[in-house]
Amino acid sequence: GDMLIEKTIKREVVLEEGTTAFKNWVKTGTTVYRQFWIFDVQNPDDVAKNSSKIKVKQRGPYTYRVRYLAKENITQDPEDHTVSFVQPNGAIFEPSLSVGTEDDNFTVLNLAVAAAPHIYQNSFVQVVLNSLIKKSKSSMFQTRSLKELLWGYKDPFLSLVPYPISTTVGVFYPYNDTVDGVYKVFNGKDNISKVAIIESYKGKRNLSYWPSYCDMINGTDAASFPPFVEKSRTLRFFSSDICRSIYAVFGSEIDLKGIPVYRFVLPANAFASPLQNPDNHCFCTEKVISNNCTSYGVLDIGKCKEGKPVYISLPHFLHASPDVSEPIEGLHPNEDEHRTYLDVEPITGFTLQFAKRLQVNILVKPARKIEALKNLKRPYIVPILWLNETGTIGDEKAEMFKTQVTGKIK
């Protein structure tokens, strides 16, 4: 009995035409939503003039349907037992699951003004940029609609810059009609314990963003893991959103629509400083903002974002050091709402439910040559938005899963 089930599982989780796994892998049967909460700045003038604490108020959720497009350019390589693909990006606004419309306005950090002196540190260039910031009537903060902020807008200051740069700015610009990848993953045909593990990303085994082993692409994309998952296992996965590989550890056993699943959670240890977790030393790439690598809970992903000062954290700076959250008022970190988890069915290794939570922040520093920033007395890691990307197996699929997998084992 058990041997037969094991044999069936091993056959059905292989990523090749005709298997259960392949069908769901090409196009997920799960509806995936991405909810956004925008941090609306309440005291922009006070911050710009007096370097006060930034008072924020989150507004949301604004919900989009994502990951509804099938993988493309799927190519099997029988030689090395891999399958390569790209994942197209798309987002459809869901008004019924949102508190407002895509035209709702927010006061947020001016992304271009904050990033410009960080990218162009030469004093002369900054003087030039300052004259253009003034000419375009730009300042430290700006008012933008949700649609503009997320998906892109033509920036008035950047439009005047006489350098060959992109003048469109947006937290996720460009997104629609783009693809993530190429991913090349093991199909598991020769070794089921390697199924879905990423062999390379964008043609490389390393990211070129981090020094040492931090640069490695480890594990799967978190949609599934090799079967027969044990509680003691650390689940490793790569997330292109945060430009790094990360891991989850067993948290609890839960019942999902009658299916026993293991909830794996991202531990606080993954966001710790090298002082608390020496393994993280290679994720600390600069010494000033990180207070000589003692700060924790924020990840500088600038190298992965063309040098822009982008920092990733958990929502509301959950698991971040006090120095990071101190200059921001209005944050309320909460483990249940703001942590990331994966509910993995242990026999198949399929992720049947997940909640990916992350926050996008921008570093803004005093810049003596930029009038809009010259009154700042300290750097701020400014929260722009946080997101909750969730997916749960549908009722129908869950029933099917129970009869075909868990039911047979019982």
Epitope: N122, S123, F124, V127, V128, R368
Partner: antibody, heavy 120, light 107 residues
Framework: QVQMKESGAELVRPGASVKLSCKAL????????IQWVKQTPVHGLEWIGG????????VYNQKFKGKATLTADKSSSTAYMELSSLTSEDSAVYYC?????????????WGQGSLVTVSA | ETTVTQSPASLSMAIGEKVTIRCITS??????MNWYQQKPGEPPKLLIS???TLRPGVPSRFSSSGYGTDFVFTIENMLSEDVADYYC?????????FGSGTKLEIK
């Protein structure tokens, strides 16, 4: 050490153009801006404009827009300034200079100057 | 455009005396003022950069002060080698503008 080597003196006819060169030595050309300064007994020192070869950024003093054109050739680490439609008002010593880049040291290194004389 | 008014136009001082040159700007430029020395037949030389910063290798008898719109350049004990023209430059905003210069001579 850092050096800015400028082209020699020029005697040019009114209405003609002249192209001055400035070869940068002893540093990475794309890391620092090169600025041009005009000096005459009457007007003293006047900033013409600057070019940052690394970002391809060029900015002019409005007064010299249309008169001066700044370019840079990364392969030879040389900056150029072309002056057009010359008149006697353009007779001056022209300097190319390099700043400190990041430390607020403006015009820290100077070339020896190119004397341009406009005369019929 | 920020106008820089430099005074005096010329100055005749005895060796060992204290020399003071002043530049006033038409707009607030924080401490973005620079000071240059130019000897005959030579290009100007940067002595003091933004933030009243004495450049490496420049003797400590040279100093500057000021913030906003009013700036002063000082030579504590004038030496014969200090005979030159002196210029201030504001680097706060474009276009960069120089003062008209001060000719320093020996009395």
């Amino acid at each position: 050490q850092v050096q800015m080597k400028e082209s020699g003196a020029e005697l040019v006819r009114p209405g003609a153009s002249v192209k001055l060169s400035c070869k940068a030595l002893g540093y990475t050309f794309t890391d620092y801006e090169i600025q041009w300064v005009k000096q005459t007994p009457v007007h003293g020192l006047e900033w013409i404009g600057g070019i940052h070869p690394g970002s391809s950024g060029i900015v002019y003093n409005q007064k010299f827009k249309g008169k001066a054109t700044l370019t840079a050739d990364k392969s030879s680490s040389t900056a150029y300034m072309e002056l057009s439609s010359l008149t006697s008002e353009d007779s001056a010593v022209y300097y190319c200079t390099r700043g400190g880049g990041y430390d607020g040291a403006w015009f820290a290194y100077w070339g020896q100057g190119s004397l341009v004389t406009v005369s019929a | 455009e920020t106008t820089v008014t430099q005074s005096p136009a010329s100055l005749s001082m005895a060796i060992g005396e204290k020399v003071t040159i002043r530049c006033i700007t038409s707009t607030d430029i924080d401490d973005d003022m620079n000071w240059y020395q130019q000897k005959p037949g030579e290009p100007p030389k940067l002595l003091i950069s933004e933030g009243n910063t004495l450049r490496p290798g420049v003797p400590s008898r040279f100093s500057s002060s000021g913030y906003g719109t009013d700036f002063v350049f000082t030579i504590e004990n004038m030496l014969s080698e200090d005979v030159a023209d002196y210029y201030c430059l504001q680097s706060d905003n474009l276009p960069f503008t120089f003062g008209s210069g001060t000719k320093l001579e020996i009395k």
